[in-house]
Interface confidence: medium
Amino acid sequence: QPSVSPGEVDKGFINIFPMINTTVFVNDGENVDLIVEYEAFPKPEHQQWIYMNRTFTDKWEDYPKSENESNIRYVSELHLTRLKGTEGGTYTFLVSNSDVNAAIAFNVYVNTKHHHHHH
């Protein structure tokens, strides 16, 4: 079956692919980057990372996977640094374009025990 170029798509779409397990174990004080790649057509208009009903205004970045004009693949990264036990929970990435909305959730568990387990 011939591939469909973005110009021939009738209805828009967004497909999100997690680049790290959606269940994340991290030791107290460690860093973790929550990363997704996503395909979006038409181009994405709104992206956000949310934790505890609060939207991150920094600590994240969103950029095209390629600089080609026909690119429909993007990357979004949320950078969590020196995590505390109280910062575990669900982190959600939301993205929308003029046709659809999509989201993916990451469950982050912060191990605060004195002897650390390495996963």
């Epitope: 692919f17 990363i35 600089e67």
Partner: antibody, heavy 119, light 107 residues
Framework: EVQLLESGGGLVQPGGSLRLSCAAS????????MIWVRQAPGKGLEWVSR????????DYADSVKGRFTISRDNSKNTLYLQMNSLRAEDTATYYC????????????WGRGTLVTVSS | DIQMTQSPSSLSASVGDRVTVTCRAS??????LNWYQQRPGKAPELLIY???SLQSGVPSRFSGSGSGTDFTLTISSLQPEDFATYYC?????????FGQGTKVEIK
Amino acid sequence: EVQLLESGGGLVQPGGSLRLSCAASGFTFSNYTMIWVRQAPGKGLEWVSRIWPSGGGTDYADSVKGRFTISRDNSKNTLYLQMNSLRAEDTATYYCARRVGASRYFDLWGRGTLVTVSS
Amino acid sequence: DIQMTQSPSSLSASVGDRVTVTCRASQNIDNYLNWYQQRPGKAPELLIYAASSLQSGVPSRFSGSGSGTDFTLTISSLQPEDFATYYCQQSYSNSRTFGQGTKVEIK
């Protein structure tokens, strides 16, 4: 101790194959993007490849695209670089490194393993 | 691809000297610029990230500045252990290109 240790280097004939390994310890390997960088004898550093934490996304330098494959086994805390169709110009010390944060810098490096491609 | 050009390629200096290394990107890279030190026979070590942020454990005599296309690494008072090769690296685009390196030698 937080460290990376490469292995698998050696002497190989042009057109041959080699698989490098990088064993990680002391940190939660599955949470980090990992990269390979190489350095030809007496020359500068060259970025080779990158892999997302889950192994789901990869990128390569043009000089190795189609010949090298980066992969990882998070259950073994190990990063790999499969090198096929090796050329004399691939002779170098190969370093694995850990990528961190929004600035995408490499904060932890292995000691390197030497690959020599010669007949 | 983004090209990174360092200058000078080598320099001779004495202990206590102030040393400056520059790095120029072929296009705007904002502050996506990192600096590494490599001593002979050793792996590179991160000194500065995001153009001006000092990596934990790195002495304060090292500093970085710049944004856009022009960047500088400064060693305020050169110490014996600072004789090494220094590399800049852009992390703006997917192919994380390095500069060709600046070798700092003893005068």
